[in-house]
Interface confidence: medium
Amino acid sequence: FSPLRRISIKILVHSLFSMLIMCTILTNCIFMTMNNPPDWTKNVEYTFTGIYTFESLVKILARGFCVGEFTFLRDPWNWLDFVVIVFAYLTEFVNLGNVSALRTFRVLRALKTISVIPGLKTIVGALIQSVKKLSDVMILTVFCLSVFALIGLQLFMGNLKHKCFRNSLENNETLESIMNTLESEEDFRKYFYYLEGSKDALLCGFSTDSGQCPEGYTCVKIGRNPDYGYTSFDTFSWAFLALFRLMTQDYWENLYQQTLRAAGKTYMIFFVVVIFLGSFYLINLILAVVAMAYEEQNQ
């Protein structure tokens, strides 16, 4: 080993060196949080870049650059360091038009903390491992969601467009002429029945166990879907989103109530099955895989 390499190895394995890098990263993160940084912070930025460059040079001199098994670029954690340095010099010395977009990559410096703190390294390692192991569970989840989305599509397509429409029309008014002239929320409230405080017209259905309209109103299928048109089973993609919402239990009771009002109470069976299989089983299966991966990484 050359004297330069010996010195580099000594520096690299020294605990003070790790401490210096950790402190640098944390200080850098503090500076990054500043709203309107003063002019002198520019010099501090250069100092940080210098320390990161020094760290990488020490690692390259001690371990080699890329040829050989344990060299600098063979460790994925060093890829992050390399990218951070490259972007630091790019944003500083190369005129690249929209620099603000490139400046975003400075945030990657915060991720350097992971490679320095051993506990964090373990957790992130487990996270990456769990993502690899999750592929099968993800395929199963997407498959199950797709199957239920197709069932939902067949059962509820167009149902959420059912609305309670006012009976007393003017002589020459038609549903089409009304829908063409409706512009504001106020116009809609004139013709459709709204519950107090609701932003969507009251849903209804044509089956005996679905929601009925109050006196003076008839159930019609017209207009857009609830929640600005985002809640529906009208296409596979919207149905898939609705099923994902059920699986994650994201305000799912609202979707459940809307659908049951428009389609009928019998369809609660569909929701019971989806919640049990999707929300209780699949979500916990995902958590189990993550837990297993973390356990393996710890060992």
Epitope: N167, L175, E176, F206, C219, I222
Partner: nanobody
């Protein structure tokens, strides 16, 4: 395509009765609301009566107590007209708000009209 066909019109003496019927032909998934309108010569079209699937019924003030609207389980609506007066002379139209197919929107459909003449 959905079509509404009216029948039962004709000439009747004042005080007489007529029964108009309207049937929907073609693909009909769901009938939401059926109504009878009339247009007397030189006048605007006006609502006579309507019936909804829930049994909600309404009549124009001029025909209350004399006319009766009803619908059956099939795609038909009827207008029973009693104690007819000369001012009831008009072209009677049937109108329905209906959904032709399960995935289509509710639309407004009109019949061609049937003429009712009340004259002595």
């Amino acid at each position: 395509e959905v079509q509404l066909v009216e029948s039962g019109g004709g000439v009747v003496q004042p005080g007489g009765s007529l029964r108009l019927s309207c049937a929907a032909s073609g693909p009909v998934f769901n009938i939401n609301r059926m109504a009878w309108y009339r247009q007397a010569p030189g006048k605007q079209r006006e609502l006579v009566a309507y019936v909804t699937p829930t049994g909600d019924i309404s009549y124009a003030d001029s025909v209350k107590g004399r006319f009766t609207i009803s619908r059956d389980a099939s795609k038909r609506v009827y207008l029973q007209m009693n104690s007819l007066r000369p001012e009831d002379t008009a072209l009677y139209y049937c109108r329905a708000l209906l959904q032709p197919r399960r995935y289509s929107n509710t639309r407004t459909y009109w019949g061609q009209g049937t003429l009712v003449t009340v004259s002595s």
